[in-house]
């Protein structure tokens, strides 16, 4: 049987009286081994026959003395089997063996949990020679024990290629509970139950857990470690911790904050990065996420023109990268822009609205009803048209660009004319007779040149022909009309 040494047990601070796992009353030691060092050692208990060699792992020497008497089997003497002490206390324990003097170079090594202890340990071996035998005492001391010193210690000695092994000495370092799992911060949905876990170990066991929420004890009766607390739901942020109690006292975990998920705050600092005629690139700074990751954002765009119908265009985008290009806008228009983002709980309010404008663009349509006719008397070609609708001018008209291409007998020549925005007619000189003139017109703004109208062709005869009816822009679906005069 393993014998035990133990420090005086202190009563459980919260639960006096018998309870599961309580320490038994200490026994008076049968034998207290002396120690030269100055620290207060743990008490050590030895069996009733301290000097009796054990029959475990023994070496029977083959050498005999002069009288030819066989030598007794070699074995470590029994010593204390179990030492219980508090963290940071000192401890010293030993192995002893009597070895016949015929054996030379006997060394004792210390092993812990199957691994040899080398180097920075306080192991001392003392030899006490006598006429026939030498008593060897190997001492092992630890000045300030830690939990990592817990374990089973043995001595080993090699003689005659035989290994002699001592009985184990179990060291049990007791202290305040040590957390192996503490509650963790969480973000939770309002009024929804969730779990927190707390686990602590001794020795000594048992370790009992109390939960604390906002400084109030949740469970007035302890729960054995590990403990899972089901929190029935929160309406506001709370701080939780757990207390771990054992016979040595209590340890308190870190306090963790449990936040309640909420809708996000509105984005801030919505700003214009770039504007074109039909798009605006915006960026924003997200608001507080409400303890729940953003999922996506919504850009709301409404025309700032007081005469507009006030309809809102909505563009959805991912929450990152806080940047969005709003497309399909009208040129030279004013818009109010707001941004809202959502998490799993819901949508934020809309950011403060900002005003933004698109720039001028090139017109999106060509001039309408283009007609061309030959004024032979002045040797000119007259061109007339209607300006594009204001909505589709995409800016302020600064004029028109007229392209006229002259083709005859394998020769082709394109000329461009710029005319001012006033009026809707132009006159160009005949460049070549007996040729086809193809005319196209585009509207021009500061934003650029719009599309050209469909081509209108007119044949310019040789000199002396009569001025006939004009050519005009065809109806949709008709291919290049040619009026031959």
């Amino acid at each position: 049987a393993i014998t035990e040494a133990r420090e005086e047990a202190k009563p459980y601070p919260l639960f006096p009286g018998p309870f599961p796992g309580s320490l038994q009353t200490d026994h008076t030691p049968l034998l207290s081994l002396p120690h030269a060092s100055g620290y207060q050692p743990a008490l050590m208990f030895s069996p009733t026959q301290p000097g009796r060699p054990h029959t475990g792992n023994v070496a029977i020497p083959q050498v005999t003395s002069v009288e030819s008497k066989p030598l007794p089997p070699l074995a470590f003497k029994h010593t204390v089997g179990h030492i219980i002490l508090s963290e940071h206390k000192g401890v010293k324990f030993n192995c002893s063996i009597s070895v016949p003097n015929i054996y030379q170079d006997t060394t004792i090594s210390w092993w812990k949990d199957g691994k040899e202890l080398l180097g920075a340990h306080h192991a001392i071996t003392q030899f006490y020679p006598d006429d026939e035998v030498t008593a060897i005492i190997a001492s092992f001391s630890i000045t300030s024990v830690q939990r990592s010193d817990n374990g089973s210690y043995i001595c080993k000695m090699k003689i005659n290629n035989e290994e002699i092994v001592s009985d184990p000495i179990y060291i049990e370092v007791q202290g305040l509970p040590h957390f192996t799992k503490q509650p963790e911060s969480m973000n939770v949905t309002r009024n929804t139950a969730f779990n927190l876990t707390c686990q602590a170990v001794g020795p000594p066991e048992p370790v009992n857990i109390f939960w604390v929420q906002n400084s109030s004890r949740v469970n007035e009766q302890p729960e054995k470690s590990p403990s899972v607390l089901t929190v029935p739901g929160l309406t506001e942020m709370a701080v939780f911790s757990c207390e771990a109690h054992n016979d040595k006292g209590l340890t308190v975990s870190k306090g963790v904050q449990i936040n309640i998920k909420a809708i996000p705050s509105p984005p801030t600092e919505v700003s214009i990065r770039n504007s074109t005629a039909h798009s605006i690139l915006i960026s924003w700074v997200p608001g507080f996420d409400g303890y729940s990751p953003f999922r996506n954002c919504s850009i709301q765009v409404k025309e700032a023109d007081p005469l507009s119908n006030g309809s809102v265009m909505i563009f959805n985008t991912s929450a990152l990268p806080h940047l969005y290009q709003i497309k399909q806008l009208q040129a030279l228009a004013n818009y109010s822009i707001g941004v809202s983002c959502m998490n799993e709980i819901g949508w934020s309010a809309v950011s403060p609205w900002i005003l933004a404008s698109t720039t001028e663009g090139a017109p999106s349509v060509a001039p309408l009803n283009v007609t061309v006719f030959l004024n032979e008397s002045s040797d000119n070609v007259d061109i007339r048209w209607m300006k594009p609708p204001t909505k589709q001018q995409d800016g302020e008209l600064v004029g028109y660009r007229i392209s006229h291409v002259w083709q005859s007998a394998g020769i082709s020549k394109e000329l461009l004319e710029e005319v001012g925005q006033n009026g809707s007619r132009a006159r160009i000189s005949v460049q070549v007779h007996n040729a086809t003139c193809t005319v196209r017109i585009a509207a021009v703004t500061r934003g650029g040149v719009g599309p050209f109208s469909d081509p209108v062709k007119i044949f310019i005869p040789a000199h002396g022909w009569v001025d006939y009816a004009p050519s005009s822009t065809p109806a949709p679906g008709n291919a290049d009309p040619v009026l031959i005069i």
Epitope: P16, G17, F19, Q213, S216, E220, Q221, P222
Partner: antibody, heavy 118, light 106 residues
Framework: QVQLVQSGSELKKPGASVKVSCKAS????????LSWVRQAPGQGLEWMGW????????TYTDDFKGRFVFSLDTNVSTAYLQISSLKAEDTAVYYC???????????WGQGTLVTVSS | DIQLTQSPSFLSASVGDRVTITCRAS?????MHWYQQKPGKAPKLLIY???NLAQGVPSRFSGSGSGTGFTLTISSLQPEDFATYYC?????????FGQGTKLEIK
């Protein structure tokens, strides 16, 4: 199923003592605390305190310190309330209630009427 | 000690009515529990931790609130709901009960 069964009604003279029992069944007795609640005739509920069934340690509220004693016999899963030096104003129904996390009294005994009258 | 004040103390209502009982705490509490007591019977847990229905309690009962203000609502009164209702706080020892609200048939 969880049950708390209390002892029957008591009629006592002033100055006497009474001991009310509360026997628990349907759960592990030592895992939940036991509270005692008083209800005077026509009045509301008053929490008297509780006993830790794990350690046997009682806790009393200020109004119930002195003449009131909570005790246990864990072998028979029973809690006791003893009142000594009874007064007329101790006349009330006394309830035991199982006491869980967050101070919830989730199961109640049927109540014991203690009448103190000369 | 934290004082709990229930209002109203008496309430007359008819079957099918929606009724709300309020419990106000003298200082902030963590949770409020609600109990129902019928004459000559022990109290019965109705709602725990402000808004959680106890086992077997019909869904017409609901609870809400935080801090110092809490409510118990019965969405559509049934004949078996006529009783006295008590609130009880958790968050500060000693635990205290409200004075009760007696719900009577109109």
């Amino acid at each position: 199923q969880v049950q708390l069964v209390q002892s029957g009604s008591e009629l006592k003279k002033p100055g006497a003592s009474v001991k009310v029992s509360c026997k628990a069944s349907g759960y592990i007795f030592t895992t939940y605390g036991l509270s005692w609640v008083r209800q005077a005739p026509g009045q509301g509920l008053e929490w008297m305190g509780w006993i830790n069934t794990y350690s046997g340690v009682p806790t009393y509220t200020d109004d119930f310190k002195g003449r009131f004693v909570f005790s246990l016999d864990t072998n028979v899963s029973t809690a006791y309330l003893q009142i000594s030096s009874l007064k007329a104003e101790d006349t009330a129904v006394y309830y035991c209630a199982r006491y869980t996390n967050y101070g919830v009294f989730d199961y109640w005994g049927q109540g014991t009427l203690v009448t103190v009258s000369s | 000690d934290i004082q709990l004040t229930q209002s109203p103390s008496f309430l007359s209502a008819s079957v099918g009515d929606r009724v709300t009982i309020t419990c106000r705490a003298s200082s902030s509490v963590g949770y409020m529990h609600w109990y129902q007591q019928k004459p000559g019977k022990a109290p019965k847990l109705l709602i725990y931790a402000t808004s959680n229905l106890a086992q077997g309690v019909p869904s017409r009962f609901s609870g809400s609130g935080s801090g110092t203000g809490f409510t118990l609502t019965i969405s559509s009164l049934q004949p078996e709901d006529f009783a006295t209702y008590y609130c009880q706080q958790w968050g500060s020892l000693p635990f205290t009960f409200g004075q009760g609200t007696k719900l009577e048939i109109k």
